[in-house]
């Protein structure tokens, strides 16, 4: 028998420095977690003590904090090189700055293979990107070889900016021939490493013949066997075992997100490359693990540029700004209210005596809110804090939509409610009531909007044929998170100001903020 240790990360989202337990900015160092310096200590400890070790990343290193805002991916290449990653799969966020923003800082600088079998380049891009990412890579590990085959969510064109010259194929259809190719090369131990979410990971384990292990990402899935060590609730045991269509037991793993855990999976193979056993657990990277001094020194060196950029106080909050996915993807959250209020405030234009303002409404996808802000840091809010909340470098845009389109958008907001998906809308200038006992597409039972053509603003029922102005993220205007109806039906689209700047300006203007949850979004009795 031959034993392989797979160490894996996914959805690190620019958390190069240690963070608080909820993956926002580290406030009390003695209770902070993760970060590449701490990760390196653990990785080096395991590499020293165990014989056959691979360090893999399942995508979405890009995007999430000021590190990415400032360094744009150069930091990912540098520190992943320093940690000596063995391979990485492309995630959807690796395309957030377009293909060029992937090629120059990361693909050209990485000293490890970057993989995706289901992304096919065409047109002029094909020759430019050739060889910079691969469908698979065969890695020597001890006296054996291991094949790593990559995959990326086929939803990436809806989630990011890969442009028109990359085709995202169905994962299973694309993976099978690559795995078959590896088999013909006499590679009998194959890991599928990718970024399509836990449901697809399980499907790949079930459907792709020859895949021995699936290491995934995208859905921030936390798996654990036994008593979990922190706040995350396991979605299943680690590893999650899928019985493949050809009768094999295939371990599937994922390691939550934000570098809080290091996935640790031990696989035992027989001489024919069959998995005999698999066991392990994510390792919580808490403060009992010291930060590596060499990596930490490098982090501090790179930090200097960020400090100049980001550490000035913009204003104060006297309340917790709840930007957690557990809140903002399920119900009204005060972080959503704050951002929408800032968006409206940024668009105050008193150009007509008939109107108190030209726009009163804001919608914001809950999935775009990426971090909370703790008020217990003296209430201080910095650009850096906001960059963790709104890491995508988007803009808040002005669109004109018919009432019927807005109604469709709100139906879409809850069409698959409860799965922690990003399309759940936070709002401003809108009162919505949902009845989740009704079938998807018919769950909006009340939708009132704040009048604009009035001296005393009040809420009136939405009129299907009326044209409304709405402030929203450019992501939504472009049909992101499945809001195709907005993209297809908008009557006018004017691009606006940078998202973080809108919120920072508002906080600076207000000086002290205390946004509340105030009944903008309600669920009718008995259904929530």
């Amino acid at each position: 028998a031959w034993e392989l240790t797979i160490l894996h990360t996914n959805d690190v989202h620019s958390r190069l420095e240690q963070t608080s337990e909820d993956s926002s900015k580290c406030v009390n160092a003695s209770r902070c977690m993760g970060g590449v310096a701490r990760l390196f200590t653990k990785v080096q400890q395991i590499r020293r003590a165990e014989p056959n070790v691979l360090l893999l990343d399942a995508g979405d290193q890009y995007q999430g904090t000021i590190w990415f805002t400032v360094y744009k991916g150069a930091e990912v290449a540098h520190f992943m090189n320093a940690l000596r990653y063995d391979a990485m799969a492309l995630g959807n966020h690796e395309f957030d700055n377009g293909v060029e923003g992937l090629i120059e800082p990361l693909l050209k600088e990485a000293k490890f293979p970057i993989l995706s079998a289901n992304i096919k380049a065409k047109g002029p891009l094909a020759s430019q990107i050739s060889g910079l990412y691969l469908p698979y890579k065969v890695l020597p590990v001890g006296d054996e070889v291991v094949g790593i085959v990559g995959y990326t969510s086929k939803e990436t064109p809806f989630l990011s900016n890969p442009g028109t010259n990359l085709v995202f194929e169905d994962e299973i259809t694309a993976l099978q021939p690559e795995v078959d190719k590896l088999k013909t090369l006499n590679v009998n131990k194959i890991i599928a490493l990718g970024h399509s979410g836990f449901e697809m990971d399980k499907l790949i384990a079930q459907k792709v013949r020859g895949v021995d292990v699936v290491v995934g990402g995208h859905s921030n899935t936390f798996l654990y066997t036994g008593n979990p060590p922190s706040k995350e609730v396991p979605a299943g045991k680690y590893p999650f075992i899928v019985t493949s269509d050809d009768g094999r037991k295939v371990p599937v793993v994922q390691a939550y997100a934000f570098g809080k855990y290091l996935g640790y999976l031990k696989i035992e193979f027989d001489e024919r490359g069959n998995v005999i056993s698999s066991h392990g657990n994510p390792i919580l990277l808490n403060s009992s693990i010291p930060e590596d001094p060499s990596i930490k020194a490098d982090i501090n060196k790179w930090r200097i540029k960020l400090d100049n950029y980001s550490t000035q106080e913009l204003g104060k909050t006297i309340v917790y700004l709840d930007g957690s996915s557990q809140s903002c993807r399920f119900r009204e959250c005060n972080m959503g209210n704050l951002i929408c209020d800032a968006m409206i405030n940024n668009n105050l234009r008193h150009t007509d005596e008939m109107f108190w303002n030209h726009v009163s409404m804001c919608i914001l996808n809950g999935g775009g809110i990426r971090s909370p802000i703790d008020e217990r840091n003296n209430g201080t809010i910095t650009w850096e804090n906001l960059a963790a909340v709104l890491p995508f470098g988007g803009t808040f845009d002005l669109v004109q939509l018919k009432g019927s389109t807005l109604k469709k958008a709100f139906e879409h907001s809850v069409h698959r409610y409860g799965q922690s998906t990003g399309e759940f809308l936070q709002v401003g200038g809108i009162h919505v009531v949902y009845d989740l006992s009704r079938k998807p597409g018919d769950r909006v039972v009340k939708l009132d909007v704040l009048c604009t053509k009035c001296r005393v603003p009040s809420y009136d029922p939405l009129k299907m044929d009326e044209v409304y102005k709405v402030i929203l993220p450019n992501f939504l205007a472009n049909g992101g998170d499945g809001f195709q109806m907005i993209k297809d039906e908008l009557l006018r689209h004017d691009s606006g100001d940078q998202d973080i700047n809108v919120v920072s300006t508002y906080i600076s203007k207000m000086k002290v903020i205390y946004p509340a949850v105030e009944g903008r979004i309600k669920f009718s009795t008995g259904s929530h």
Epitope: A49, E50, I289
Partner: antibody, heavy 116, light 107 residues
Framework: VQLQESGPGLVKPSQSLSLTCTVT?????????WNWIRQFPGNKLEWMGY???????KYNPSLKSRISITRDTSKNQFFLQLNSVTTEDTATYYC??????????WGQGTTVTVSS | DIQMTQSPSSMYASLGERVTITCKAS??????LSWYQQKPWKSPKTLIY???NLADGVPSRFSGSGSGQDYSLTISSLESDDTATYYC?????????FGGGTKLEIK
Amino acid sequence: VQLQESGPGLVKPSQSLSLTCTVTGHSITSDYVWNWIRQFPGNKLEWMGYISYSGIIKYNPSLKSRISITRDTSKNQFFLQLNSVTTEDTATYYCAGDEYFWFAYWGQGTTVTVSS
Amino acid sequence: DIQMTQSPSSMYASLGERVTITCKASQDIKSYLSWYQQKPWKSPKTLIYYATNLADGVPSRFSGSGSGQDYSLTISSLESDDTATYYCLQHGESPYTFGGGTKLEIK
């Protein structure tokens, strides 16, 4: 975590030195790296080698031809064997456990004299 | 092998005095350095790890500093209990190597 060295206090030149380290309060297969370190009469310290929780072994190249570190997981013990000893191997021998590269846990040491 | 040169090899200091012991590596060891205190007939005890981090249970009068090739251990106010021999260890590269030791005695 407690470590206790044991073995003969006197070894003849050209013979083999064999020492045992018994670990209590921690399984030697769960984690940590288990080291042998010696201290010569002039107080100079020398790292000799380790065996990890998974059985990986690393030796100081200066001793590589003479040293062997093994373990008995059922007894939670690890062992040092040093062959072809000379009077230069007279020292206090320590076993030590380390989690993150520095030696956090030490035995009390056992003195070995090489003499005919 | 990386050589660790410790100085002084012995020293006398008064109670309450600030004491500094230095360790120089023959190459950059990137702060992979720990400090140990050994009292007569006892085994060494970790004081500092990763050059600057105080080990659990170690009094705060002990501190470590340095980077690259040059490191130091400081006792801010010497106490009688600090009579011992102090060693540095580099664990950045195998084989791990110790400094020659500094014997500290009370004046």
